[in-house]
C-alpha cells in the first residue's frame, strides 16, 4: 500500500481467483484514543472500533472511503483504491490501446517545435467517475523539471456503438534549449482513477522523436504563362522553431483529386515554392518535416487548383 | 559564445555539401546496423545515450545561433580552447566565435573517426563477419575534416591487446552511431545556418 495523495491510498493486488489479498491497517488521524468507530462509504454499518482498523482487501467491495467517527462526528477519511496485477502485468482497463506507432501505446505525445513544450493525449470509453493526474520529468534518476497542466477532455467521437473520449495535457520543460542534443528522455506519468480502480501509464521519449510541425501557412498559387504548370508558394508555420536557417524544414507538395485513388503529381523540396501541374477539381497540398531529423510529417495545408 | 550573423558570402561555404553527405551516410549506416543487428539492443529506446565528446568539445554551445543566445537555458558555461585556422571560413571577416564553432566540429569528427576505426578493426576480427562500418561514412568524415582543414595533433588509434567481446562491440557501435547521428544533425543545422548568414 502506498499514498497517492493526502488520505488516498493505493492497494496493489495480485488478481486471480481465491487470491489472499492484502492486509491493510488504517489509522484514524486524531488525537482521540477511545470511542472511535469505522464505516465504509455511505453505509452506517460499523466495521470495527478503535484507533486502527485492520482489513483484508481482496476485491473492489473492500475498497472505498473508510471513515472514522466519534459520537457522530467525522474524524478522518482514508480512500482505498485498487491497482490490479494479473499474471504479473498491471491492468490497463481505463485507457484504450492506440496501437500507433506500436501495440500497448496508451499515451501519445507530439511537439510542434523544439521549445520543450509538448502535448500528450489518450483515449477512453469511460465517461464518468474518471480523474487523471500527470507528472513529467527529464530523466528519472536525477530528474529535471517539466511542468504539466491539468488534463482536460479535448474531444468526443462516436466509434460504432461506443463513444470515445480524448483527454489531453500540455507540458513544458522548465529550462529547455531548442538547440540542445537530448541524451535523457522525457518521462510522462499519468495516474488514472476510475471509481475505485487505480492505473498508471507511462511514456518515455525524446522531443526530437515526437516533433510534428504545424502545416505550412499562406499557400498561394501563381499560374505560369502558356503552361499547365502552377507555381505554389508557402511559408514556415508560425509555431516552428527559429531561426529557420538552423531549424530547417523540407516539404512535400502534392496535387490530387478528392479520392486518394486518383492520379497525382508529387514533388519534394527544401524551398518554400514549387512548380506543379494543376488539374481541374484537384487540390494542391503541402506538408512539412524537419529537414535533418525525420520525425513526423505535418498535416497537409491545401488550396483548390481552380 | 555564439555565431554572429555577419559570416561568409552566400555560396562560399564548402562545408555545407559535406555535412549533408555526412548526415546521409551516418543515417544510412545506423539504419543498416538496426537491420543487421535486429536481435541486439540497437534502437533508440534500447540503448544508453552516451556522448563521447562530452566535456571534450562544446559544439552545441560554440555553434549556437545568435537568436538563441537570449535563451539562458542554451548558455552552458563549458569552456574549451581550440585552434583557429579553418578553410571553411570563406571570408576574412569570419569571427573568432565561428572559428571556435568549426574547430569544435572538427574535434568531434576526429574523435568519432578514431572510435569508428578502432571499432572497425575489432569487427573485422569477428568470425561471424556480421557488420562492418560503411567505408562511405568513413570517407565522408574524412572529406568534411579536410574541408574544415584545422591543424590538430593526431589522436593515436586505440589498440587493445585483449580478445574483443564482439557482442559488446556491436552494442557500442549502436550507441556510437546514435550519438554520431545526433551530432551530425547539429553539424548540418550549423552549416545550413552559416551558409544562410
Amino acid at each position: 500500500i502506498w499514498e497517492l495523495k493526502k488520505d488516498v491510498y493505493v492497494v496493489e493486488l495480485d488478481w486471480y481467483p481465491d487470491a489472499p489479498g492484502e492486509m491493510v491497517v488504517l489509522t484514524c488521524d486524531t488525537p482521540e484514543e477511545d470511542g472511535i468507530t469505522w464505516t465504509l462509504d455511505q453505509s452506517s454499518e460499523v466495521l470495527g472500533s478503535g484507533k486502527t482498523l485492520t482489513i483484508q482487501v481482496k476485491e473492489f467491495g473492500d475498497a472505498g472511503q473508510y471513515t472514522c467517527h466519534k459520537g457522530g462526528e467525522v474524524l478522518s477519511h482514508s480512500l482505498l483504491l485498487l491497482h490490479k496485477k494479473e499474471d504479473g502485468i498491471w491492468s490497463t482497463d481505463i485507457l484504450k490501446d492506440q496501437k500507433e506507432p506500436k501495440n500497448k501505446t496508451f499515451l501519445r505525445c507530439e511537439a510542434k517545435n523544439y521549445s520543450g513544450r509538448f502535448t500528450c493525449w489518450w483515449l477512453t470509453t469511460i465517461s464518468t467517475d474518471l480523474t487523471f493526474s500527470v507528472k513529467s520529468s527529464r530523466g528519472s534518476s536525477d530528474p529535471q523539471g517539466v511542468t504539466c497542466g491539468a488534463a482536460t477532455l479535448s474531444a468526443e467521437r462516436v466509434r460504432g456503438d461506443n463513444k470515445e473520449y480524448e483527454y489531453s495535457v500540455e507540458c513544458q520543460e522548465d529550462s529547455a534549449c531548442p538547440a540542445a542534443e537530448e541524451s535523457l528522455p522525457i518521462e510522462v506519468m499519468v495516474d488514472a482513477v476510475h471509481k475505485l480502480k487505480y492505473e498508471n501509464y507511462t511514456s518515455s521519449f525524446f522531443i526530437r522523436d515526437i516533433i510534428k510541425p504545424d502545416p505550412p501557412k499562406n499557400l498561394q498559387l501563381k499560374p505560369l504563362k502558356n503552361s499547365r504548370q502552377v507555381e505554389v508558394s508557402w511559408e514556415y508555420p508560425d509555431t516552428w522553431s527559429t531561426p529557420h536557417s538552423y531549424f530547417s524544414l523540407t516539404f512535400c507538395v502534392q496535387v490530387q483529386g478528392k479520392s486518394k485513388r486518383e492520379k497525382k503529381d508529387r514533388v519534394f523540396t527544401d524551398k518554400t515554392s514549387a512548380t506543379v501541374i494543376c488539374r481541374k477539381n484537384a487540390s494542391i497540398s503541402v506538408r512539412a518535416q524537419d529537414r535533418y531529423y525525420s520525425s513526423s510529417w505535418s498535416e497537409w495545408a491545401s488550396v483548390p487548383c481552380s | 559564445r555564439n555565431l554572429p550573423v555577419a559570416t561568409p558570402d552566400p555560396g562560399m561555404f564548402p562545408c555545407l555539401h559535406h555535412s549533408q553527405n555526412l548526415l546521409r551516410a551516418v543515417s544510412n549506416m545506423l539504419q543498416k546496423a538496426r537491420q543487421t543487428l535486429e536481435f541486439y539492443p540497437c534502437t533508440s529506446e534500447e540503448i544508453d545515450h552516451e556522448d563521447i565528446t562530452k566535456d571534450k568539445t562544446s559544439t552545441v554551445e560554440a555553434c549556437l545561433p545568435l537568436e538563441l543566445t537570449k535563451n539562458e537555458s542554451c548558455l552552458n558555461s563549458r569552456e574549451t580552447s581550440f585552434i583557429t585556422n579553418g578553410s571553411c571560413l570563406a571570408s576574412r571577416k569570419t569571427s573568432f566565435m565561428m572559428a571556435l564553432c568549426l574547430s569544435s566540429i572538427y574535434e568531434d569528427l576526429k574523435m568519432y573517426q578514431v572510435e569508428f576505426k578502432t571499432m572497425n578493426a575489432k569487427l573485422l576480427m569477428d568470425p561471424k563477419r556480421q557488420i562492418f562500418l560503411d567505408q562511405n561514412m568513413l570517407a565522408v568524415i574524412d572529406e568534411l575534416m579536410q574541408a574544415l582543414n584545422f591543424n590538430s595533433e593526431t589522436v593515436p588509434q586505440k589498440s587493445s591487446l585483449e580478445e574483443p567481446d564482439f557482442y559488446k562491440t556491436k552494442i557500442k557501435l549502436c550507441i556510437l552511431l546514435h550519438a554520431f547521428r545526433i551530432r551530425a544533425v547539429t553539424i548540418d543545422r550549423v552549416m545550413s545556418y552559416l551558409n544562410a548568414s
Epitope: R228, D265, R266, V267, T275 | -
Partner: antibody
Framework: EVQLVQSGAEVKKPGATVKISCKAS????????LHWVRQAPEKGLEWMGW????????EYAPKFQGRVTITADTSTDTGYLELSSLRSEDTAVYYC???????????WGQGTLVTVSS | DIQMTQSPSSVSASVGDRVTITCRAS??????LHWYQQKPGKAPKLLIY???QSISGVPSRFSGYGSGTDFSLTINSLQPEDFATYYC?????????FGGGTKVEIK
Amino acid sequence: EVQLVQSGAEVKKPGATVKISCKASGYTFSDYYLHWVRQAPEKGLEWMGWIDPENGDTEYAPKFQGRVTITADTSTDTGYLELSSLRSEDTAVYYCAANKELRYFDVWGQGTLVTVSS
Amino acid sequence: DIQMTQSPSSVSASVGDRVTITCRASQSISINLHWYQQKPGKAPKLLIYFASQSISGVPSRFSGYGSGTDFSLTINSLQPEDFATYYCQQSNSFPLTFGGGTKVEIK
C-alpha cells in the same frame, strides 16, 4: 494485370511523320498519366512528353516542342505519339509508360522501333 | 534542364558482390529521383522511387540512398539476374531527365 501494348515497328523516310499507338488494359485508362520515352540505339533514355487522358492536357519536352503530338482516345483506351519532320537521329525504340504519379514511370510498353532512313 | 550524371558508365562484378552506382544532379533535386533497371531488348523496370522507397516485388537487395545532388543505388549480393543497365531519373522539374546509364557486367 496493368499492361501497355504498342504497335509494331515502323520504317520512315526523313521528313515523314510517324504515329505509333499504345493500348492500355488492366486499369481505367483515364486514371493514369501516359508518357512517351525514347531510346536511340546503344543510348540512354529520353523523355518526350505526357498526356492526361482524362482531360487531354499535355506537356512536351522543349526539345520536341512543335514536332510532337501526344493524344489519347478514351473510347479505345489507346494513347498515340505522332512525331513529324523525322530525321535519322529520331531512329530509336519508343516506349509508352504510365503511372498514377505524374513524374516517374511504373508500367512500360514493350517498345516500338522506328527507323528513319532514306 | 537538369543534367543527371551517372558513374561509372560500366562496372564488372561477380555474383555475390556488392555494387554501388552513383548519380549526381546538376542542381539540388531533394529526393525527386528514381531508379530503373533495363535488360537488353526489354523495357525499363522501376526499382526505387523518391531516392529510397522500395517497390513491392523488387528484391530487398536493391536499396537507394541520397538527397540533394548525390544519390546511389546499391545492390547487396549481386545475383545473375541483376546483370543489366541501370538508369536514374530526376522528377524535380520538367523536362524529366535520365542519367546516361550504368551497365553492370559479369566479371
